[in-house]
């Protein structure tokens, strides 16, 4: 190999060991029989050398540095050449470095031809191995602007006082052009300006200077986004840290077209703007840091550009001003993403503050809109608390558990509407009365409606799930001893049409000791399946539940249990079941931990089934499933 550098070219070539393959025979640069691992060639020198190995690219790297001095004379602006030409260099991983020094008052602009650049974060690499590392200067301090790959949106980077651009090319890469040019500009009065151009839909991830280390103190950095007018841009902060400010405040400022409040100032922890039409600027402003404990300011953010959806121009009013203790969250439903570019799906408050999820609270009227290609990607979860603190005031008081129509009119599917029902301990209990009798969901007879009510204890220490209930069954009411949550969960978009079938009234009633009482009025047409609460996990220790089963005068009820034994093994106490005729009060008692379960029995009058648990040994839980079937009486036994 021969490398000859013209005089006055201000180019230095350095060949040095890279990161050697540890278990390889060392390789050397050989110059007139001398073996060396580092060779420096300066302007005006001509050197002939060879390598002592067959594959020097596995051992050595080459750095070609050109110093461009804009301090003492005119600057060589225009397209930057790769010098010496890559064809004259040994095939090693090569880094071309251009170090431009200029006066503080002079702006320098790097312009990148197509393909534009894409910034990468720490630990990331470029697919083709070609990387652009760009740094600036503040006095004597070097500031890393960022590392970039090809195929992105960054078209120009403006700096002042100097710029260092390093282009890394793998040994096998055929590239023979720098891909950028340098122009002079007036002073930009800040650390740098990065221009990012979107031709169509897409996203860009960008980072503050020195990321993931700290942004220089009291500096200003600007990103200019060029977005076609027919598209919308949204900004989301992926990661940020704030330093400890002594004076001034760290912030981001937006210049947004058409905004009457430019610049719009946001804290880094604020929700950032979305649904912006056309070009906009974002600036990051640092502060004067505390000398003792400066901390670090850093920011990594994403700009998502996409077509506005029809929904993005519609404003929906969610009036929660008359509600109390209620919150509504619109959020992405969990899905596996497969598409390469997934347009963002945002919900916007007042059309401007957009994010992937939004929580609205009671007491206010909210205006929301959507910036989303497919609203089925979102769903709604609502929580409302109805609590009684004074038992004298609440007794016999009723509340309707209805989804407010404002919520049903939103173009997003309701997933859960949860009512937390709270009562004073040992003073009051609750009764749930449905507008339409309920069916308990079981494997034998699953619910196939568009929604169900999930009823569970709301006492933190108690793991008690009464079950899932849907309209169209035989359960007339459910009484529960203490705090519960009732969740209306939807399963199909057709819930909108079936919303009229929802309707549940909760009343506060005098306290009773049983955990739950189900009032069942079976229909003659169908078999009613009932199961103990906490199915699969077992009825909690020492818990008692009852079913009040009505039998019409002209019918006979057949009570059937679906296994021979309960399977429960008691650690302490006894588990038992009482079946009691309501008219005669005659009762049968079964020891669930010892006896076999009763064979199918016939009841001509209304009766009770009461199941009380012991403290079972782990793994031997109490789970019972039974059915009630009505058949006409053939003989009048009265």
């Amino acid at each position: 190999f021969e490398i000859a550098l013209p005089r006055e070219s201000n180019i230095t070539v350095l060949i040095k060991l890279g990161t050697p393959t540890l278990l390889a025979k060392p390789c050397y640069i050989v110059i007139s029989k001398r073996h060396i691992t580092m060779l420096s060639i300066k302007s005006g020198e001509r050197i002939v050398f060879t390598f002592s190995c067959q594959s020097p690219e596995n051992h050595f790297v080459i750095e070609i540095q050109k110093n461009i001095d804009c301090m003492s004379g005119p600057c060589p602006f225009g397209e930057v050449q790769l010098q010496p030409s890559t064809s004259l260099l040994p095939t090693l991983n090569r880094t071309f470095i251009w170090d431009v020094k200029a006066h503080k008052s002079i702006g320098l602009e790097l312009q990148f031809s197509i393909p534009r650049l894409r910034q990468i974060g720490p630990g990331e690499s470029c697919p083709d191995g070609v990387t652009h590392s760009i740094s600036g200067r503040i006095d004597a301090t070097v500031v890393r602007i960022g590392t970039f790959c090809s195929n992105g949106t960054v078209s120009r980077i403006k700096m002042q006082e100097g710029v260092k651009m390093a282009l890394h090319l793998p040994w096998f890469h055929p590239r023979n052009v720098s891909g950028f040019s340098i122009a002079n500009r007036s002073s930009i009065k800040r650390l740098c300006i990065i221009e990012s151009v979107f031709e169509g839909e897409g996203s860009a991830t960008l980072m503050s200077a020195n990321y993931p280390e700290g942004f220089p103190e009291d500096e200003l950095m600007t990103w200019q986004f060029v977005v076609p007018a027919h598209l919308r841009a949204s900004v989301s902060f992926l990661n940020f840290n704030l330093s400890n400010c002594e004076r001034k405040e760290e912030r981001v400022e937006y210049y947004i077209p058409g905004s009457t409040t430019n610049p719009e100032v946001f804290k880094l922890e604020d929700k950032q703007p979305g649904n912006m039409a056309g070009n906009f600027n974002l600036s990051l402003q640092g502060c004067d840091q505390d000398a003792q404990s400066p901390g670090i300011l850093r920011l990594q953010f994403q700009v998502l550009v996409q077509h506005p959806q029809n929904e993005s121009n519609k404003i929906y009013v969610v009036d929660l001003s008359n509600e109390r203790a209620m919150s509504l969250t619109i959020e992405p439903r969990p899905v596996k993403q497969s598409r390469k570019f997934v347009p963002g799906c945002f919900v916007c408050l007042e059309s401007r503050t957009c994010s992937s999820n939004l929580t609205l609270t009671s007491g206010s009227k909210h205006k929301i809109s959507f910036l989303c290609d497919d609203l089925t990607r979102l769903w709604m979860n609502v929580e409302k608390t109805i609590s009684c603190t004074d038992h004298r005031y609440c007794q016999r008081k009723s509340y309707s558990l209805q989804v407010p129509s404002d919520i049903l009119h939103l173009p997003v599917e309701l997933h859960d509407f949860s009512w937390k029902l709270l009562v004073p301990k040992d003073r009051l209990s609750l009764v749930l009365v449905p507008a339409q009798k309920l069916q308990q969901h079981t494997h034998e007879k699953p619910c196939n409606t568009s929604f169900s009510y999930l009823v569970a204890s709301a006492i933190p220490s108690q793991d008690l799930y009464f079950g899932s209930f849907c309209p169209g069954g035989s359960i007339k009411q459910i009484q529960v001893k203490q705090n519960i949550s009732v969740t209306l969960r939807t399963f199909a978009p057709s819930f909108q049409q079936e919303a009229s079938r929802q309707g549940l009234t909760v009343s506060f009633i005098p306290y009773f000791k049983e955990e739950g009482v189900f009032t069942v009025t079976p229909d003659t047409k169908s078999k009613v399946y009932l199961r103990t609460p906490n199915w699969d996990r077992g009825l909690p220790s020492l818990t008692s539940v009852s079913w009040n089963i009505s039998v019409p005068r002209d019918q006979v009820a057949c009570l059937t249990f679906f296994k021979e034994r309960s399977g429960v093994v008691c650690q302490t106490g006894r588990a038992f079941m009482i079946i009691q005729e309501q008219r005669t009060r005659a009762e049968e008692i079964f020891s669930l931990d010892e006896d076999v379960l009763p064979k199918p029995s016939f009841h001509h009058h209304s009766f009770w089934v009461n199941i009380s648990n012991c403290s079972p040994t782990s793994g031997k839980q109490l789970d019972l499933l039974f059915s009630v079937t009505l058949t006409p009486r053939t003989v009048d036994l009265t």
Partner: antibody, heavy 116, light 106 residues
């Protein structure tokens, strides 16, 4: 097991010639640089030179050019150091070693005493 | 030739004490290698490529440096660390050793 076994101690007359051997086992010398180091009594280490057994290329410390000659026989997996025109200055322990960037194997050393 | 200068030539340390020895090259070298030698034994490769410990070397040893200035550090001296340590450059032939630092235990 990787080993470099050097030939036994030598007592030689001034002006004579000696040839030390270093037989490798557990690795192929063609994949390594084989080099020799001299250590005079109570002194430090001095690099003598090396051979690339794959192609026979050698390098020597210029101070020992003409004094030392390194050869290798890949068929017997052995490296050799020949020292000529011996003087009392050549009395030392001679170590052979094989090296990669991150791996080195050393022999136990051969003591050469030059005495009349 | 690249001249390697090790300092100090002789030092002693108490058990548990932190020990640092240095190696200075007369011109810039890519990496530094270190060897440990005990009396009547062959030198043992100790640190390669400036900062990597050879197989079997205790983690209390570390190496650092660049250009012309390198060092070997023992975070907490132990009796078995008493030996002579040599640095060597493999960057430019002849591949010279330093004069050695003899480390004794107090």
């Amino acid at each position: 097991e990787v080993q470099l076994k050097e030939s036994g101690a030598e007592l030689v007359r001034p002006g004579a010639l000696v040839k030390l051997s270093c037989k490798a086992s557990g690795f192929n010398i063609k994949d390594y640089y084989m080099y020799w180091v001299k250590q005079r009594p109570e002194q430090g280490l001095e690099w003598i030179g090396w051979i690339d057994p794959e192609n026979g290329n050698t390098i020597y410390d210029p101070k020992l050019q003409g004094k030392a000659r390194i050869t290798a026989d890949t068929s017997s997996n052995t490296a050799y150091l020949q020292l000529s025109s011996l003087t009392s200055e050549d009395t030392a322990v001679y170590y052979c070693a094989g090296r990669l960037y991150a791996m080195e194997y050393w022999g136990q050393g051969t003591t050469v005493t030059v005495s009349s | 030739d690249v001249v390697m200068t090790q300092t100090p030539a002789l030092m002693s340390a108490s058990p548990g004490e932190k020990v640092t020895m240095t190696c200075s090259a007369s011109s810039s070298v890519s990496y530094m290698y270190w060897y440990q030698q005990k009396p009547r034994s062959s030198p043992k490769p100790w640190i390669y490529l400036t900062s990597n410990l050879a197989s079997g070397v205790p983690a209390r040893f570390s190496g650092s440096g660049s250009g012309t200035s390198y060092s070997l550090t023992i975070s907490s001296m132990e009796a078995e660390d008493a030996a002579t340590y040599y640095c060597q450059q493999w960057s430019s032939d002849p591949f010279t050793f330093g004069g050695g630092t003899k480390l004794e235990i107090k």
